[in-house]
């Protein structure tokens, strides 16, 4: 069962921090780890390793802990004030503008460009024209125009939300 | 005596809008969190939203998700749905309700939904 | 989300009998989290038990609530004529939060 908090355990200075969602402390506010009950009265342990919260709060319900997904590497367990961290794997990243899913990261730069930044989780190689130095825009490219090997396909999709 | 008293139901064209009331007496209002539930005809009890007793946490059911928006008035002790771009399958009576999670320990008498062309 | 199966579908007893309502989880609720309504035609639901097993206020003490995990029982020991109506379970562990589809008590 989860730990209960009284508004009166809680530190006056805790009562009425953040004071952003609210028109007073005495409609209460939760610290992180916790959630509100439904009648005001407690503040309620969010479940180690199931759901978390990380600011204050007046949640009826702590978060879902992310699960990672496979084509990913947890760089640090959820917790009870925090998510999971998940991370994709070697040689795949995660773009900003396609976040659920990693992609395999090329193997190499079209004709006449040279790599000038590895594969990362976050980004892909980075390939600058030889002679202008100007950045590949980031598509990849056909085989026939790869220095190296062909290009990887779309990993499988990696979620981000619990 | 705990008293939950809903209103602003009514017939609406599909892709219409409609606000539902439920005025609240007899508890500390903005101590309780508050749902709405609904009930199609013929039908069993389907939640809608729910929402915080300060209003800083909002809950929806899929189904309503970007459409029903849950809000309410502390000092005016009372609790709203905005129902926009309303749909046949959204037709049903809707019951004001106190509690979010462990019970619904009070209930309105329901206000009537119809969404009819 | 939490899809709870209520079981039977409709219940055909006679005053005095006992009724007994199953409701089951599709992933384990918390007994906190787990109540019964009652319904009857052209009214609002009334909340019976709450936790699982503790009656409501006003509730008679015929009405008994009982389980853990993903199953969970409501128990009528003898019908009274009031009694015959629909009964839901509710689970409020994880949004959104559900009710079962209802279990209809009638006179045989």
């Known amino acids: 069962e989860s730990a209960l908090i009284t508004q009166q355990d809680l530190a006056p200075q805790q009562r009425a921090a953040p004071q952003q969602k609210r028109s007073s402390p005495s409609e209460g506010l939760c610290p992180p780890g916790h959630h509100i009950s439904e009648d005001g009265r407690d503040c309620i342990s969010c479940k180690y390793g199931q759901d978390y919260s990380t600011h204050w709060n007046d949640l009826l319900f702590c978060l879902r802990c992310t699960r990672c997904d496979s084509g990913e590497v947890e760089l640090s367990p959820c917790t009870t004030t925090r998510n999971t961290v998940c991370q994709c794997e070697e040689g795949t990243f995660r773009e900003e503008d396609s976040p659920e899913m990693c992609r395999k990261c090329r193997t190499g730069c079209p004709r006449g460009m040279v790599k000038v930044g590895d594969c990362t989780p976050w980004s892909d190689i980075e390939c600058v024209h030889k002679e202008s130095g100007t950045k590949h825009s980031g598509e990849v490219p056909a085989v026939e125009e790869t220095v190296t090997s062909s290009p990887g396909t779309p990993a499988s999709p990696c979620s981000l939300s619990g | 005596e705990v008293q939950l008293l809903e209103s602003g139901g009514g017939l609406v064209q599909p892709g219409g809008s409609l606000r539902l009331s439920c005025a609240a007496s007899g508890f500390t209002f903005s101590s309780y969190a508050m749902s709405w539930v609904r009930q199609a005809p013929g039908k069993g009890l389907e939640w809608v939203s729910a929402?915080?007793?300060?209003?800083?946490?909002?809950y929806y059911a899929d189904s309503v998700k970007g459409r029903f928006t849950i809000s309410r008035d502390n000092s005016k002790n009372t609790l709203y749905l905005q129902m926009n771009s309303l749909r046949a399958e959204d037709a049903a009576v809707y019951y004001c309700?106190?509690?979010?999670?462990?019970?619904?320990?009070?209930w309105g008498q329901g206000t009537l939904v119809t969404v009819s062309s | 989300e939490i899809v709870l199966t209520q079981s039977p579908g409709t219940l055909s007893l006679s005053p005095g009998e006992r009724a007994t309502l199953s409701c089951r989880a599709s992933q384990s609720v918390s007994s906190s989290y787990l109540a019964w309504y009652q319904q009857k035609p052209g009214q609002a639901p009334r909340l019976l038990i709450y936790?699982?097993?503790s009656r409501a206020t006003g509730i008679p003490d015929r009405f008994s609530g009982s389980g853990s995990g993903t199953d969970f029982t409501l128990t009528i020991s003898r019908l009274e004529p009031e009694d015959f109506a629909v009964y839901y379970c509710q689970q409020g562990q994880l949004p959104p939060i559900t009710f079962g589809q209802g279990t209809k008590v009638e006179i045989k």
């Open positions: 936790g699982a097993s």
């Open positions: 929402i915080s007793g300060s209003g800083g946490s909002t």
């Open positions: 309700a106190k509690g979010v999670r462990k019970k619904f320990d009070y």
